[in-house]
């Protein structure tokens, strides 16, 4: 039921799930200098029954200075460069009750979490696309992709989206936000998932329940 590959890569665009289907896994990764606690969970899992979905297991990180034989899970710099990333504000919404039946919302950050989030999606997951700042969608309406099972094999539908840089120099209100890098993930990467996110609290944004993220590519 896990999707075999990642959602389609669209140049100058990023994607986000509104909610995560039961069965979705989120790797417990720690930032550099920290590691999972001994006997800590490898991942969080979206589970539930007909009326309630929540993330099982809690990710916990501790300082690597503490002598321990637990394997370091912080991504190495070369691995970080290869993964598709987005910047993310710290979610402010309650998270254990699902937004949609059979779905979990974005888990809150855990202490000393890695700058990337790696999700393993399941069949039926939908992700939504948005052109990064400075780029325009040529098509009208939303752009989305769904992981489907066809003839025993999973595939993501292709979103109707082309993001173009055709615009005058834009001036953005308030604080300047980082411009997107046009670089995409290398073709060779075929891991089972996966969105990753860079946590960053930005001012001026008060979100009630939505996953509050600003989307650019990792630089």
């Amino acid at each position: 039921e896990l999707c075999d590959d990642d959602p389609p890569e669209i140049p100058h665009a990023t994607f986000k799930a509104m909610a995560y289907k039961e069965g979705t896994m989120l790797n417990c990764e720690c930032k550099r200098g920290f590691r999972r606690i001994k006997s800590g969970s490898l991942y969080m899992l979206c589970t539930g029954n007909s009326s309630h979905s929540s993330w099982d297991n809690q990710c916990q990180c501790t300082s690597s200075a503490t002598r321990n034989t637990t394997k370091q899970v912080t991504p190495q710099p070369e691995e970080q460069k290869e993964r598709k990333t987005t910047e993310m504000q710290s979610p402010m919404q309650p998270v254990d009750q699902a937004s949609l039946p059979g779905h979990c919302r974005e888990p809150p950050p855990w202490e000393n979490e890695a700058t990337e989030r790696i999700y393993h999606f399941v069949v039926g997951q939908m992700v939504y696309y948005q052109c990064v700042q400075g780029y325009r969608a040529l098509h009208r309406g939303p752009a989305e992709s769904v992981c489907k099972m066809t003839h025993g094999k999973t595939r993501w539908t292709q979103p109707q989206l082309i993001c173009t840089g055709e615009m005058e120099t834009s001036q953005f209100p308030g604080e300047e936000k980082p411009q997107a890098s046009p670089e995409g993930r290398p073709e060779s990467e075929t891991s089972c998932l996966v969105t990753t996110t860079d946590f960053q609290i930005q001012t001026e944004m008060a979100a009630t329940m939505e996953t509050s993220i600003f989307t650019t590519e990792y630089q």
Epitope: A13, K16, A17, M18, Q89, Y128, Y129, Q130, C131, Q133, Y135, R136, A137, H139, R140, G141, P142, A143, E144, L161, C163, E166, M167, E168, T169, S170, Q171, F172, P173, E204, M205, A207, E210, T211, S212, I213, F214, T215
Partner: antibody, heavy 122, light 107 residues
């Protein structure tokens, strides 16, 4: 076909706050921005700002920075606009409007709510 | 901020007339311009986006043209339902701004 249904008219005192809601009926939010536009009686249209529901990124008009907050609740497909420290010149019809494409909040508006009249009077 | 100047502010016309409304931007906005129609007590309705693209469901008598700083909305043959106020909107640069409106009234 998605429709945007807004909350009812409000009468407020100067200095108070108002929170207007905008619910997507007949569909759910996606990554299309929800913007807020107001129109004072007999006047033209003024863009207040916009937010992308799933992504959460918001942009506000400079003149309203610090007084306005836009949020969304994806579980109910509802957007909210809160305006604080109300003044008499905030009296207007407030519209929510959906962006026509996934180009952030810098977009045209293809679907509009019916409008919410907010009167600020002592 | 980009100023959007519409002319004329009021236009008197008869059914069947060809009507042209002009919108000027204080600086180039490429083709990122939309036109809306608004009737009293109602929300605006999108007619044209990206300067010349007709929104789905809008009658073909409406057309838009222009790029850079000069834009026009043309109604090829004015119908009774077209008497309303028309606004242009630029969405190239924040903040998004609207023209002051052109009221099309019955002559």
């Amino acid at each position: 076909q998605v429709q945007l249904v807004q909350s009812g008219a409000e009468v407020k005192k100067p200095g108070s706050s108002v929170k207007v809601s905008c619910k997507a009926s007949g569909g759910t939010f996606s990554s299309l921005a929800i913007s807020w536009v107001r129109q004072a009686p007999g006047q033209g249209l003024e863009w207040m700002g916009g937010i992308i529901p799933i992504f959460g990124d918001a942009n506000y008009a400079q003149k309203l920075q610090g007084r306005v907050t836009m949020t969304t609740d994806t579980s109910t497909s509802t957007a909210y606009m809160e305006l604080r420290s109300l003044r008499s010149d905030d009296t207007a019809v407030y519209y929510c409007a959906r962006g026509g494409s996934v180009s952030g909040t810098l977009v045209d508006f293809d679907i509009w709510g019916q409008g919410t009249m907010v009167t600020v009077s002592s | 901020d980009i100023q959007m100047t519409q002319s004329p502010s009021t236009l008197s016309a008869s059914v069947g007339d060809r009507v042209t409304i002009t919108c000027r931007a204080s600086q180039s906005i490429s083709s990122w311009l939309a036109w809306y129609q608004q009737k009293p007590g109602k929300a605006p309705k999108l007619l044209i986006y990206k300067a010349s693209s007709l929104e789905s469901g809008v009658p073909s008598r409406f057309s838009g043209s222009g790029s850079g700083t000069e834009f026009t909305l043309t109604i090829s043959s004015l119908q009774p339902d077209d008497f309303a106020t028309y606004y242009c909107q630029q969405y190239n640069i924040y903040p998004i701004t609207f023209g002051g409106g052109t009221k099309v009234e019955i002559k």
